[in-house]
């Protein structure tokens, strides 16, 4: 024990100065008659030690560290011993902060564990061992006068909460509660809470259940859910209000809140939801009108709303087989009448024979948008409905009648863009109730079964834009039929392209006869192609050796042309351009040479 360190304080505020002295006893002077005392903080040598020999022969070194910026470090007093540093003594220094005032102290009463659980935020790190104690006392009034003290509650290390057990609690009586924080640099206390444990009670949530359907009870309406909850029995006598939250299981919808609901509304019909949708539901409750804490949300209940019967208008159209007029092909389209019109599971076409009250004969049941059936000979009308598990749409009557109404006139069609066609007409007199417009590929690809159709409900309409199933370079047949109260007018049809193709190639030029100043050319016209508009004209171009160009426009029926005014013994490049409304294409170039003046004409 040659040396001994003493310090002004082993624990200081972080950044504060610290003074230390190291005394080396005289009996250690064999080390060196005048030993130089060195200081080391951690691994670093510290300059600034002031050394002196005391009257009793001991050596003393005093050092002041101006700022202790380490939260923990060892300060060593050393001597040089040969080539190494010999530590004579060392002390542990700590630096940190006094405890901040604990804040956000809050408590809740758990009736299941019969304890009052209080939690707080300890504040910033002190870097020093800091103890927290939850202190409390019983009070008759509003905590101004202190009654019996309650045993301190000391949390486990590192925890910022503590439980006061039931034996230390008095329900329906106020308690003063606060947190005391303490370390080597000071003590702090949180503001005091004054509370009756029952006023911070946190109840368990009810259990949500689906309501067992009873035979006499009406089933829930579309978009509604019937549910009930089983209150947490131990909290049953506490007046509470509850709230329900729900959201669709699919999608990103946020929770929707419903409340307040009394705990006693043990069964509930929740409406205004999407039909045929799976929902997640939870409930929570709070003591009310007296104070309390919200319970946690209950475990989720998953329920599906009932669907609603389809609310759609069915636009219908039909066609008879030419070989067998009693075989009818019926087409329809559902038009939603509301934003949420209900899921459609399928369609039924049925017929009610006259004189057979109540008897309905199904003719077809399908999920498609058309069906073909044999129409009984006495049937003039069938009914079409859309259905799902909740019921059917209003029946749409389909009347099979002769074409007795007036025809529309001046049916015409024109391209709007490569994927749409405008069809226009002059309405007949009287106005029809509407029109059916059908379109599909024209010859040679025409097919009755592949036609697209649309219903135009406005009888005063004078045209319709076809946007479905229109492709460029295809010939379309468009059929328009006017619809009247109990009949229809004759169908009219027109053919059109939405976009025509330019000629794919121009005819090859052939030299038929040549002279000194002329050349007779001919070509074989290309056969007309479907999807390509007819030729409007040809243009023939020729260029001489001096790069002078000449041209002539010829009508589309031309089969040949004679070039006049050519120079003898001259070279010419000639090509033909075939043009239609959709564009033009050039032929390959024909090169020829006119005859020399002495040469004889070639035929």
């Amino acid at each position: 024990e040659c040396g001994h360190i003493s310090v002004s304080a082993p624990i200081v505020h972080l950044g504060d100065p610290i003074t230390a002295s190291c005394i080396i006893k005289q009996n250690c002077s064999h080390l060196d008659p005048e030993p130089q005392i060195l200081w080391r903080l951690g691994a670093e040598l510290q300059p600034g030690g002031r050394q002196q020999r005391l009257s009793d022969g001991t050596q003393e070194s005093i050092i002041t560290l101006p700022h202790l910026n380490h939260t923990q470090a060892f300060l060593s007093c050393c001597l040089n011993w040969g080539n190494s540093l010999q530590i004579l003594d060392q002390v542990e220094l700590r630096a940190g902060y006094p405890p901040a005032i604990p804040h956000n102290l809050s408590c809740l009463m758990n009736l299941t564990t019969s304890s009052l659980i209080c939690q707080w935020e300890p504040g910033p790190e002190t870097h020093l061992p800091t103890s927290f104690t939850l202190k409390s006392f019983k009070s008759r009034g509003n905590c101004q006068t202190q009654g019996d003290s309650i045993l301190d509650c000391v949390p486990k290390d590192g925890q910022s909460h503590c439980c006061i057990p039931r034996k230390h609690l008095l329900l329906y009586q106020n308690m003063g509660i606060w947190v005391q924080a303490e370390n080597a640099l000071g003590t702090s206390m949180s503001p005091q809470l004054c509370l009756d444990p029952m006023d911070v009670v946190k109840l368990e949530p009810p259990m949500l259940r689906t309501m067992d359907p009873s035979p006499e009870a009406a089933p829930p309406q579309a978009g509604c859910l019937q549910l009930c909850w089983e209150p947490w029995q131990p909290g049953l006598h506490i007046n509470q209000k509850c709230e329900l939250r729900h959201k669709p299981q699919r999608g990103e919808a946020s929770w929707a809140l419903v409340g307040p609901l009394p705990l006693e509304a043990l069964q509930y019909e929740l409406c205004g939801l999407l039909p045929a949708t799976a929902y997640t539901l939870q409930i929570r409750c709070i003591r009310w009108p007296l104070p309390g804490h919200w319970s946690d949300w209950s475990p989720s209940l998953e329920l599906r709303t009932t669907e609603r019967a389809p609310t759609v208008r069915l636009d219908t159209w039909w066609r008879q087989r030419q070989l067998d007029p009693r075989t009818v092909q019926l087409f329809w389209k559902p038009v939603p009448l509301e934003e949420d019109s209900g899921r459609i599971q399928g369609y039924v076409v049925s017929w009610r024979p006259s004189g057979q009250a109540g008897a309905i004969l199904p003719l077809c049941n399908t999920t498609e948008l058309s069906c073909t059936f044999h129409l009984p000979s006495e049937a003039q009308e069938v009914a079409l409905v859309a259905y799902n598990s909740a019921g059917t749409s209003r029946p749409t009557p389909v009347v099979f009648s002769e074409s007795r109404g007036p025809a529309l006139t001046r049916l015409h069609a024109m391209a709007r863009d490569p994927h749409s066609l405008w069809v226009g007409w002059e309405p007949p007199n009287p106005w029809p109730q509407g029109y059916v417009i059908e379109w599909g590929l024209g010859p040679p690809s025409a097919s009755n079964s592949n036609k697209t159709w649309r219903m135009e409900q406005n009888g005063r309409a004078t045209g319709f834009l076809l946007k479905e199933n229109i492709r460029p370079f295809q010939l379309y047949e468009i059929i328009v039929t006017p619809l009247y109260q109990d009949t229809m007018g004759p169908s009219q049809h027109v053919y059109a392209y939405s976009q025509e193709m330019a000629p794919s190639h121009a005819p090859e030029l052939h030299l038929k006869h040549i002279g000194k100043t002329w050349a007779q050319l001919e070509w074989v016209p290309e056969p007309p192609e479907l999807g390509k508009s007819p030729l409007t004209h040809y243009t023939i171009f020729w260029t001489n050796a001096q790069n002078q160009s000449f041209s002539a426009i010829l009508n589309a029926s031309s089969r040949g042309f004679v070039l006049h005014g050519l120079e003898p013994a001259s070279l010419y490049h000639i090509h033909l351009m075939a043009a239609s409304q959709a564009g033009a294409t050039n032929s390959t170039v024909l090169t020829l040479m006119t005859l020399t003046p002495e040469g004889s004409e070639l035929h």
């Epitope: 009736l111 299941t112 564990t113 019969s114 039931r166 034996k167 329900l171 029952m198 209150p231 029995q233 131990p234 049953l236 006598h237 506490i238 007046n239 009394p262 006693e264 509304a265 043990l266 009108p289």
Partner: antibody, heavy 118, light 107 residues
């Protein structure tokens, strides 16, 4: 001061009916559960039925289920017990009680005697 | 249903004695146990609720303890006015049940 005053007790033949009433005062009646507890001569206490503050929840002891009906009129601060199909074993002093939030019987009436005998 | 078993069914004691009555539930009831005192010809009176909370106006010689299934009512120093029948009652779940009672008589 809380007061509970029972009435309606008396002698009734087996199979008969009786309606007990309990007039409450001194507290906000509509905020509390209320209940009936009975005590047969020389026997212990037996819980009969309770009713929630708004009357929506009404549990019963198995021995009276289907025969007794508990109800309340919050506008009159009165609790009722309708007793039908009475049996000899229903003979008891019937106490009306105010329940605390944790289900204890906080305040009691003085009781009314119901005797079922032919 | 939760059954409540009280013991003893009766006991004799002298003024100044320390008296202990126990009540056992057939299943856990947390702290939902209440104690009542009844004197002959009178209505019961609440002494202790939620296992250990003394009802207002009840002398501090009465105390309650226990949780779960086993509970105790203690009278630290029996007084002449304490001779009565004592009942426990569980309020954890319906049907609410009373114990059979313990009659405290003068020795």
């Amino acid at each position: 001061e809380v007061q509970l005053l029972e009435s309606g007790g008396g002698l009734v033949q087996p199979g008969g009916s009786l309606r007990l009433s309990c007039a409450a005062s001194g507290f906000t009646f509509s905020l509390y559960w209320m209940g009936w507890v009975r005590q047969a001569p020389g026997k212990g206490l037996e819980w009969v039925s309770s009713i929630s503050s708004s009357g929506g929840v009404t549990p019963y002891a198995d021995s009276v289920k289907g025969r007794f009906t508990i109800s309340r009129d919050n506008s009159k601060n009165t609790l009722y017990l309708q007793m039908n199909s009475l049996r000899a074993e229903d003979t008891a002093v019937y106490y009306c009680a105010k329940l605390g939030e944790l289900g204890f019987f906080q305040e009691w009436g003085q009781g009314t005697l119901v005797t079922v005998s032919s | 249903d939760i059954q409540m078993t009280q013991s003893p069914s009766s006991l004799s004691a002298s003024v100044g004695d320390r008296v202990t009555i126990t009540c056992r539930a057939s299943q856990g009831i947390s702290s939902y146990l209440n104690w009542y005192q009844q004197k002959p010809g009178k209505a019961p009176k609440l002494l202790i609720y939620y296992a250990s909370n003394l009802q207002n106006g009840v002398p501090s010689r009465f105390s309650g303890s226990g949780s779960g299934t086993d509970f105790t009512l203690t009278i630290s120093s029996l007084q002449p006015e304490d001779f009565a029948t004592y009942y426990c009652q569980q309020s954890y779940a319906y049907p609410q049940q009373f114990g059979g009672g313990t009659k405290v008589e003068i020795k």
